[in-house]
């Protein structure tokens, strides 16, 4: 049944689409932008815990003018998926639940077998999304390559296909700052630099807080990241503008440690007003 | 090390040359922005290595407005905006590294204290 007059099942399974996607919601995916070559997707790793791989498989006659030549039922139709070390299988979704295949992976989630029907009938067309965990992607990962192979016990020669994406490591860091207070006032009399003994002699105090947030996974390889603050210490003629008293980094050094920033502030060695800290 | 600005004795101040004098007495309503990115101020860059963190790191910087400079240079100005900028940089051999929205601008407004009497 479903094998034409010659009773030989000559299927025509085709993987007509294999493209990487961003997961928007549980069953909604958006294709990644393409590289200039038009065949490689661009994946920015910015805290996305998963990437989707959209797969569309058809079993249609190769020549609509000769529909009996092939496109017969594909018995024990399967899609075999080989994942790189950087990706791990986490699930499968389909917009239409009736198109969701049964996908089972090996223990380390590097190899997946999806059952596409027994048989996958003549004229069938299914679209589904493999959900792949990106937790294995490191800063050294430059490319994702997933090898895909359709299989059937029906008569058909099948060859592996690769889906590729170029990886950009988009560090999921954001920065925000605030000044306390946001308005300052000056008054009094002019005093020379040498007359300054304590920071209170200098002028109105101001505190800046700059927060760096990491919205993604823990960044293990941030040994070469720096938080920089451009501090306007003088006006164009070289006179003091904002005098830096103290610079302290909290949270970038490991538990409970205060970070050292360079250069050191308070180069005039003015007395610190402890009430201001 | 951070070099201190050129020091002058209290009584030895030179008259400013017009090339950088911020305002004339006829421009008492002027608003000025002091920003290193625009060349209207000079900056020292404090750089803090982020060795490792999971969620957030906070940089605290305490400073003082140099009162005398403002009295000398900007007492006739309506308002000044002083800009502090901060960013994250990553030094890496990795070519495919990208940082988006990794900078911020922190403005502070500075005014002559309305209660003050400035000694000419």
């Amino acid at each position: 049944q479903g094998c034409g007059e010659d009773k030989i099942c000559q299927s025509n399974l085709q993987l007509v689409r294999a493209r990487f996607c961003t997961r928007v919601s549980d069953t909604e995916f958006q294709p990644l932008p393409m590289d200039v070559d038009g065949t490689t997707a661009l994946f920015a790793l910015s805290g996305q815990p998963v990437i989707g791989l959209e797969l569309m498989v058809t079993n249609l006659p190769s020549d609509p003018a000769q529909p009996q030549a092939d496109g017969d039922d594909a018995h024990e139709a399967q899609l075999l998926v080989m994942l790189p070390d950087s990706l791990h299988y986490s699930g499968v979704r389909a917009l239409d639940p009736a198109e969701k295949p049964l996908c089972l992976s090996n223990e380390n989630a590097s190899h997946v077998e999806c059952e596409l029907g027994n048989p996958m009938k003549r004229g069938a067309q299914v679209t589904f999304y493999l959900i792949l965990s990106t937790s294995g992607i490191s800063i050294e990962t430059t490319e994702l390559e997933v090898e895909l192979l359709l299989a059937t016990i029906s008569e058909q020669e099948l060859h592996p296909v690769s889906a590729r994406a170029r990886v950009f490591i988009e560090l999921p860091l954001s920065i925000a700052g605030m000044a306390i207070p946001q308005q300052l006032f000056f008054s009094g009399v002019v005093r020379g630099e040498r007359a300054m003994q304590s920071e209170r002699d200098v002028g109105s105090k101001v505190k800046y807080e700059v927060t760096v947030s990491n919205q993604g996974q823990s960044l293990r390889t941030l040994g070469s990241a720096f938080l920089n603050i451009m501090w306007p210490h003088e006006i164009a003629n070289g006179k003091w503008l904002l005098y830096p008293m103290q610079v302290e980094l909290e949270g970038g050094q490991g538990p409970g440690q205060k970070g050292l920033c360079s250069p050191r502030p308070n180069i005039l060695h003015l007395d610190v007003d402890s009430r201001d800290r | 090390e951070l070099e201190p600005p050129e020091q002058q004795e209290p009584g030895e101040r030179q008259e400013p040359s017009m090339s950088w004098w911020p305002v004339s007495s006829a421009e008492k309503k002027k608003n000025i922005t002091l920003d290193c990115a625009r060349g209207t101020a000079n900056c020292v860059v404090f750089s803090c290595p982020l060795y490792s963190f999971d969620r957030a790191a906070v940089l605290h910087v305490w400073g003082r407005l140099w009162n005398s400079t403002f009295l000398e240079e900007y007492s006739a100005v309506k308002s000044l905006e002083v800009i502090v900028r901060a960013n994250i940089t990553v030094k890496s051999s990795i070519k495919n590294l990208m940082l988006r929205d990794a900078s911020t601008v922190i403005p502070v407004m500075v005014y002559l204290d309305p209660m003050a009497v400035v000694a000419e």
């Epitope: 549980d26 986490s90 699930g91 499968v92 979704r93 239409d96 639940p97 009736a98 198109e99 969701k100 295949p101 049964l102 996908c103 089972l104 059952e115 596409l116 029907g117 027994n118 009938k121 004229g123 069938a124 067309q125 299914v126 959900i131 | -």
Partner: antibody
Framework: EVQLVQSGAEVKKPGSSVKVSCKAS????????MHWVRQAPGQGLEWIGK????????RLNQEFRDRATLTVDKSTSTAYMELSSLRSEDTAVYYC??????????????WGQGTLVTVSS | DIVMTQSPLSLPVTPGEPASISCRSS???????????LHWYLQKPGQSPQLLIY???NRASGVPDRFSGSGSGTDFTLKISRVEAEDVGVYFC?????????FGGGTKLEIK
């Protein structure tokens, strides 16, 4: 023999929650969706939703979206249905039922014996 | 949601006589994959429902051949060629083409 064995009857107060279990045996638990259907006394059947034990995807009837939670424990081949904010209209027999994949066996071929949940103050 | 309407509500039948139950859906039950997901269940008194017919006309395993299903699109029929005493219970039609899956109100078959 393929079997679905459900937990025993429950009496609950309005506003509380109930969690019904369904232990599967005799087949590969992750190869079939698990559905939940309820039947109020003397009434018809109402589909609550289904869960895919292989990756815990759930599809719920919109009517139950805010109150029903479907979960599975693959290690014990057990499916669970929790219904919160119970009201008297939730008094019913709750069934788990096995369903197939990929538009094949897209029906309930094996049913549990049912769990009577009575909601009464 | 798809509304499944069954008729009659009650069906008294003499043993050995044929019986027919109708099920009408508010929308076509032909899925875009070509399958029609219309099924019939029987719930015997005090028991859980059991599958009788799946996808319009396929008998579930162990179901006697006196049960048959037919129909297409939105109109479907369950026929029992010769009713036996053990066939009493409530018959439900059900659709799984559209989410949520829905059931008919049921037809109670009783022996005269």
């Amino acid at each position: 023999e393929v079997q679905l064995v459900q937990s025993g009857a429950e009496v609950k107060k309005p506003g509380s929650s109930v969690k019904v279990s369904c232990k599967a045996s005799g087949y590969s638990f992750t190869r079939y969706w698990m559905h939940w259907v309820r039947q109020a006394p003397g009434q018809g059947l109402e589909w609550i939703g289904k869960i895919d034990p292989s990756d815990s995807e759930t599809r719920l009837n919109q009517e139950f979206r805010d109150r029903a939670t479907l979960t599975v424990d693959k290690s014990t081949s057990t499916a669970y249905m929790e219904l919160s904010s119970l009201r008297s209209e939730d008094t019913a027999v709750y069934y788990c039922a096995r369903g197939g994949y990929f538009g094949e066996q897209w029906y309930h071929d094996v049913w549990g014996q049912g769990t009577l949940v009575t909601v009464s103050s | 949601d798809i509304v499944m309407t069954q008729s009659p509500l009650s069906l008294p039948v003499t043993p050995g006589e044929p019986a027919s139950i109708s099920c009408r859906s508010s929308q076509s039950l032909v899925h875009r994959n070509g399958n029609t997901y219309l099924h019939w269940y029987l719930q015997k008194p005090g028991q859980s429902p059991q599958l009788l017919i799946y996808e319009v006309s396929n008998r579930a395993s162990g179901v006697p051949d006196r049960f048959s299903g037919s129909g297409s699109g939105t109109d479907f029929t369950l026929k029992i060629s010769r009713v036996e005493a053990e066939d009493v219970g409530v018959y439900f039609c059900s659709q799984s083409t559209h989410v949520p899956w829905t059931f008919g109100g049921g037809t109670k078959l009783e022996i005269k």
